[in-house]
Amino acid sequence: IWELKKDVYVVELDWYPDAPGEMVVLTCDTPEEDGITWTLDQSSEVLGSGKTLTIQVKEFGDAGQYTCHKGGEVLSHSLLLLHKKEDGIWSTDILKDQKEPKNKTFLRCEAKNYSGRFTCWWLTTISTDLTFSVKSSRGSSDPQGVTCGAATLSAERVRGDNKEYEYSVECQEDSACPAAEESLPIEVMVDAVHKLKYENYTSSFFIRDIIKPDPPKNLQLKPLKNSRQVEVSWEYPDTWSTPHSYFSLTFCVQVQGKSKREKKDRVFTDKTSATVICRKNASISVRAQDRYYSSSWSEWASVPCS
Amino acid sequence: RNLPVATPDPGMFPCLHHSQNLLRAVSNMLQKARQTLEFYPCTSEEIDHEDITKDKTSTVEACLPLELTKNESCLNSRETSFITNGSCLASRKTSFMMALCLSSIYEDLKMYQVEFKTMNAKLLMDPKRQIFLDQNMLAVIDELMQALNFNSETVPQKSSLEEPDFYKTKIKLCILLHAFRIRAVTIDRVMSYLNAS
């Protein structure tokens, strides 16, 4: 058993049929010695009396908020949560496996630039009785500070018969140099509680590997005289690291017809303009990627040809 | 993804082309190592990230763009000084910091060159003949060093009398290639920045 927060304890249980469970001794936080009674989850049933209460925790029915009272007055609380271990593996029931980029990916993170700011998100099908806490650091043996905000519900989606909820959190490395060469990864730890079930999830990455620039901005077309060609121009996204001559991007320009089956013409360039043939009813899209370190491409910025 | 091949203009900062070739070569070599050594811990997640130039050169600090010198997190240590007579210094107005930056890059290349050559000698003794260093990568390192043209004492190639542990050597190769790729990215950024200035 270990303390998660003040008056909140996690009992780690090997989860299998007829498991013996864990014996837990609760102590009432009071100088009083006599006339103390214990209840669970505001039940009127008295579980025991005295300054300590010994319980055998085997299942979720044994977890919950234990309260000690004296003469109708509440003295203290202890909330017991369960962390299940099945076949030597901690349970991952609360979050959904996103399976991208690989199996057992529960947390996904992205950064728009090298400032040390990043966003992580996760999915669940659970709608209520859910709370999260996020901690992060650079490295684990001698951790350097990363500050994370509160996790918030960022999207709701319908997937077949199920509703899916996306939570996200923003974190910022306390003293980040955009030009630094990372040798220690960022560690992200998410604590999750659903009802009386506790789980924790972790992710480890270098900012350079989770970079995904915003799409190029101010995408414009300029028709060239007496030609089906147009000059496409765009700018670096505002959120990209500066100076741009140091943090350079490369671009992919795509001409796509109305039908998805039509052949796509693609051009790669390091410049912020390109000349392409604009077909009728086609659209021109441009996306960006770090020029020197191949992490993710941005989403497309698009304009119609007409 | 292969990086786009840049054809340098005659007046272009002379080292940019070489640094782009360097990044392409090390990226290809790293990809080849990860494929060939698929049963070795050779991915970014599996290896220990070591920097053989740590405490010996200060490329990131010495080559910091002017715009980032206001960022206190970027200014850890800037006291290293090097020889200052490189041929990449196209402009007369080249600052002392730029010379320091380029000489730091030169020192990095020299250290990696020695490490790679020593390692290649060991890998050539491996009866499995599983992996060798790409001669193109070694040549590109050499070309960039020549373009930087700093006078520096030659570092003798390390020789080892004991029987090489080929497993350890291959893991060290992965560690070295990952680190060198990261440094090659920095070098490319620096050359791009200096070219734009």
Epitope: Q42, G64, D129, T131, V193, L196 | -
Partner: nanobody
């Protein structure tokens, strides 16, 4: 901050029925238990019924067999179905929620109360 709003109180004759509702809104986190308390004029507040996060109900002896507590998890609502009401059930009924926020810790919230009067 968790807000609780009770409704469903009113004047009813002895033997009659009422259904109280309490909706929790705001930053709820994980609810560990929901309960109904009551306070008659000049009396101490007393626990009437509670329901654990696992749905286990508990009742004060005087209401057993007459009152039923239930919870709609999806709506964060707790109900108290009161049948065979007696004059001694007259009181202000308060909703109570206890829960956990991992960022801030344990919390307890109370509703303003809804008046139940049993009289002929």
């Amino acid at each position: 901050e968790v807000q609780l709003v009770e409704s469903g109180g009113g004047l009813v004759q002895p033997g009659g029925s009422l259904r109280l509702s309490c909706v929790a809104s705001g930053s709820i986190g994980s609810i560990t238990s929901m309960a109904w308390y009551r306070q008659g004029t000049g009396k101490q507040r007393e626990l009437v019924a509670s329901i654990s996060s696992g749905g286990r109900p508990s009742y004060q002896d005087s209401v057993k067999g007459r009152f039923t507590i239930s919870r709609d998890n999806a709506e964060n609502t707790v109900y108290l179905q009161m049948n065979s009401l007696k004059p001694e059930d007259t009181a202000v009924y308060h909703c109570n929620v206890r829960g956990l926020h991992l960022d801030t810790g344990l919390y307890e919230s109370w509703g303003q109360g809804t008046q139940v009067t049993v009289s002929s």
